[in-house]
Interface confidence: low
């Protein structure tokens, strides 16, 4: 048969939960401390909450059935009677009372024909303001007759026909009634919730609803124009040209910011957005949802997309509607012919209308932003250049920030890319040009996307002109080849000598993509003399060992994930792992990862790695004098000029390295 509607699926679930109590019993969730009842879907059943409020489960006869004394459940179908009497069956006795007052309507409800009545509950009538009720029942009850006729349709309409966004023609001047049928099974009629649906009568059907509904006369644009509280919004809509859409056909939800909402924004930010047609359009579109969303449809958190493309979390807390967890909706369910308006008292500024500074202010990168300011780079981050800011997380600077000098300024300039990027379009091997004139490389790994040594730590925030990439560390542009890096650091004088001796200098100087696990002088010194002599015994063996320290692709620590098997130039694989933020190679910890070079990356290690073939074997080769001599000289030089850089904070190392 045809697919069941969301309402029918929820009813089916309630019936399933109630069947242990007998036939045609439905489980109903009642919000504690209120009279609000809901048929229950799976999620609500397990959470036992509606709008964050606890519920109790009760068991009632499913619509259309009644109890029989002495029998389990609700075995008997309700006897069919006319519409007027069915109003009493569903508990809408006030509607019956007012029907009597009109004189004309009761005969229609008891006579031939086929009608649908959306009957307000007794509570709905009782909650009407006294002056509204008075006006309905005065004027020889004409207003009351009109009001009741607006709740009626001149044919039988069951819930399976109530489709989301449809309109029904009422029996009052053929005025439209708006129907919304939400995925969570809630059905609304002019934003009033269906409480009990599909109660058949001999001459139609009765649906019980939770509000008295009234005719809808104005479109969204007209409501904006009428209300004083929308003075600023009105001007903004006019300036953006969105009024055509808001007075046209369609079904929208406008989260309408009041004058107060605009006043909460600093003048500088507001003036910038109001003076920028594209930012203004994005701002307003971020307050418009693509379909009408009544407050009654929200019983839990729901992600909705605005016309601007941002996802908002619409939820509820008790009787209050929330947006992104904040109760900023001050007036809800103002119906328009083309949708619904909810008044909000905070502006929802989308990223697309923000400067880089504003994006960064809402991210965990405030320390970096202060550094950019202090370095005099503020203009770039608040202007109209197309840029991407690579901003390290605050946690990167937990040991302190660098002094603002020429080196730091240069380093920071290399965190600004001369184009507005989106990470989803970055590809492995791509180069990006910085304001500092450096070319940075993109590395794409299975679970991360890195730019040089720094990896993206959060979703992009795309602003008006700039995009913010939140990075997991300070980015260090390469300062030379792998060979340059090693030669420029006294810790590697013995390694450099070994590389030269093994004839690998050219390899590590030319273009390429290498990961070098670089043993320090201490690593070489820590080798037993036998191992050292074996290593230096012949150039071929030395080259073989050194090639085992060189991976054939660039692997920065952020790209490791849990475990990567990296093929070495020697042929065997290196097991590179990351645990508790410590990189290990063949289970030995890396002392300092991610020293970037133009043709690779250097990871500092304090031991010499042994290829699998070499590990169990004992060999007794004699030392080659020339190689040993190079090592003696390098070792002596190294001891004479030990660097204390390893004790300094990370940034100082970066700056030191840049000075070479």
């Amino acid at each position: 048969g045809p697919a069941k509607s969301p309402y029918q699926l929820v009813l089916q679930h309630s019936r399933l939960r109630g069947r242990q109590h007998g036939p045609n019993v439905c489980a109903v969730q009642k919000v504690i401390g209120t009279n609000r009842k809901y048929f229950t879907n799976c999620k609500q059943w397990y959470q036992r909450k509606i709008c964050g409020k606890s519920t109790v489960i009760s068991y009632e006869c499913c619509p259309g059935y009644e109890k029989v004394p002495g029998e389990k459940g609700c075995p008997a179908a309700l006897p069919l009677s006319n519409l007027y009497e069915t109003l009493g069956v569903v508990g809408s006795t006030t509607t019956q009372l007012y029907t009597d007052r009109t004189e004309k309507l009761r005969p229609e409800m008891e006579g031939p024909g086929s009608f649908t009545i959306f009957a307000p509950s007794n509570e709905a009538w009782a909650s009407l303001p006294a002056e509204v009720l008075d006006s309905l029942v005065s004027n020889v009850n004409i207003e009351l007759l009109n009001a009741l006729r607006y709740h009626m349709v001149g044919r039988r309409v069951l819930t399976d026909e109530l489709k989301h966004g449809m309109t029904l023609t009422s029996m009052y001047q053929n005025s439209n009634i708006q129907i919304h049928h939400y995925p969570n099974g809630i059905v609304t009629v002019n934003c009033a919730r269906l409480l009990k649906a599909d109660h058949h009568a001999t001459n139609g059907v009765v649906h019980l609803i939770d509000k008295v509904i009234s005719t809808i006369t104005n479109n969204i644009q007209q409501i904006i124009e009428i209300e004083d509280t929308f003075e600023t919004l009105r001007a903004a809509v006019a300036a953006s040209g969105l009024n055509t859409m808001l007075e046209g056909n369609g079904q929208y939800t406008l989260l309408a910011p009041t004058n107060e909402a605009f006043e909460k924004i600093p003048s500088e930010t507001l003036n910038r957005i109001l003076g920028d047609p594209e930012a203004l359009r994005d701002l307003l579109n971020n307050h418009i949802l693509k379909s009408a969303m009544c407050a009654e449809a929200i019983v839990a958190g729901l992600s909705v997309e605005t016309l601007e493309g941002t996802t908002l979390e619409v939820g509820c807390s008790g009787d209050m509607l929330t947006i992104n967890g904040k109760a900023i909706i001050s007036n809800k369910d103002i119906l328009a012919t083309n949708g619904v308006i909810h008044y909000i008292d905070e502006l929802l500024i989308p990223d697309s209308a923000k400067t880089l500074f504003e994006l960064a202010a809402e991210s965990d990168v405030s320390t970096a932003i202060d550094l950019f300011r202090q370095a005099g780079l503020g203009n770039h981050l608040s202007g109209s250049e197309r840029l991407t800011l690579l901003a390290p997380l605050n946690s990167v600077f937990k040991d302190g920030t660098p002094p603002i000098d020429a080196h730091t300024r240069n380093l920071l300039r290399n965190h600004i890319i001369k184009d507005q990027l989106a990470s989803k379009y970055l590809y492995h091997g791509q180069t990006l040009e910085t304001l500092g004139g450096k070319k940075l490389r993109v590395f794409v790994y299975r679970n991360s996307l890195c730019i040089e040594n720094s990896c993206i730590a959060a979703h992009d925030k795309r602003g008006r002109y700039g995009t913010l990439f939140t990075m997991d560390r300070v980015l260090t542009p390469p300062m030379g080849t792998v060979m340059d890096v090693l030669k420029g650091d006294n810790r590697f004088s013995m390694l450099v000598a070994a590389i030269q001796s093994a004839g690998l200098t050219e390899t590590l100087n030319r273009e390429g993509v290498y990961t070098v696990f670089a043993p320090t002088n201490e690593a070489f010194r820590a080798l037993p003399p036998r191992e050292r002599s074996r290593l230096l015994g012949d150039a071929k063996e030395l080259a073989n060992i050194l090639k085992y320290h060189i991976g054939d692709e660039i692997l920065v620590s952020g790209g490791i994930g849990a475990l990567v098997r990296l093929k070495s130039l020697q042929g065997d694989k290196l097991e590179v792992s990351l645990k508790n933020n410590v990189v290990s190679v063949n289970k030995e910890p890396v002392a300092e990862p991610d020293i970037m070079a133009t043709n690779g990356v250097v990871h500092v290690i304090t031991n010499v790695l042994q290829p699998p073939a070499n590990r169990p074997q004992e060999r007794g080769d004699e030392l080659a004098d020339s190689a040993l001599e190079i090592f003696k000289q390098a070792s002596a030089f190294s001891r004479a000029s030990q660097r204390s850089v390893r004790l300094a904070p990370v940034y100082q190392k970066l700056l030191e390295r840049m000075k070479h």
């Epitope: 600093p266 930010t269 003076g275």
Partner: antibody
Framework: EVQLVESGGGLVKPGGSLKLSCAAS????????MYWVRQTPEKRLEWVAT????????YYPDSVKGRFTISRDSAKNNLYLQMTSLKSDDTAMYYC?????????????WGQGTLVTVSA | DIVMSQSPSSLVVSAGEKVTMTCKSS????????????LAWYRQKPGQSPKLLIY???TRESGVPDRFTGSGSGTDFTLTISSVKAEDLAVYYC?????????FGGGTKLEIK
Amino acid sequence: EVQLVESGGGLVKPGGSLKLSCAASGFTFSDYYMYWVRQTPEKRLEWVATISDGGIYTYYPDSVKGRFTISRDSAKNNLYLQMTSLKSDDTAMYYCVRGWDRYDSWFACWGQGTLVTVSA
Amino acid sequence: DIVMSQSPSSLVVSAGEKVTMTCKSSQSLLYSSNQKNYLAWYRQKPGQSPKLLIYWASTRESGVPDRFTGSGSGTDFTLTISSVKAEDLAVYYCQQYYRYPYTFGGGTKLEIK
């Protein structure tokens, strides 16, 4: 070094007009919001006018709106304040001020000021 | 308009003493979206123009000695000089840049014994 040099102040009768100028140097003038701030004889500081980096947006307090006009000539690196219908309340030292950057609104660099005296 | 009130209007201290002056705004200067306070402090030495000391309520302008500390949030702000020097003789002003018209406090005159 950032330098802001005001000129054009002097003695003027109530109802009269005066045009203040500010010559800016040591920075890219067109990249900054600029302001006029005045200091009354009682030493109270009052913001008088704002102009955006591109000269598109201008802002004034109610006390001078309609009487004062801020403008800029980025080719000459000059900021101006045209003052008309002057009142005795407008007597003050007028400072030319540079903002921090393209948008932010605190007063980062101040000139030495030019004195305007409105008196019969 | 946002009204800025400073207290005390003047104070006399000896060199080396710690000084605290306060600034109150008639409405909150904390912008919830970025958790920044739109408040600046300036000092004006006799015969000179004002000079920026602090912005964002607590960020020192470069070149400003670290004996100057800005603190506070919302409507209540404080400028503290940890150890006053003779050269700190000046009038200190707070200013809000949260909303036009931008407004200043009346100033706190610091005199040295």
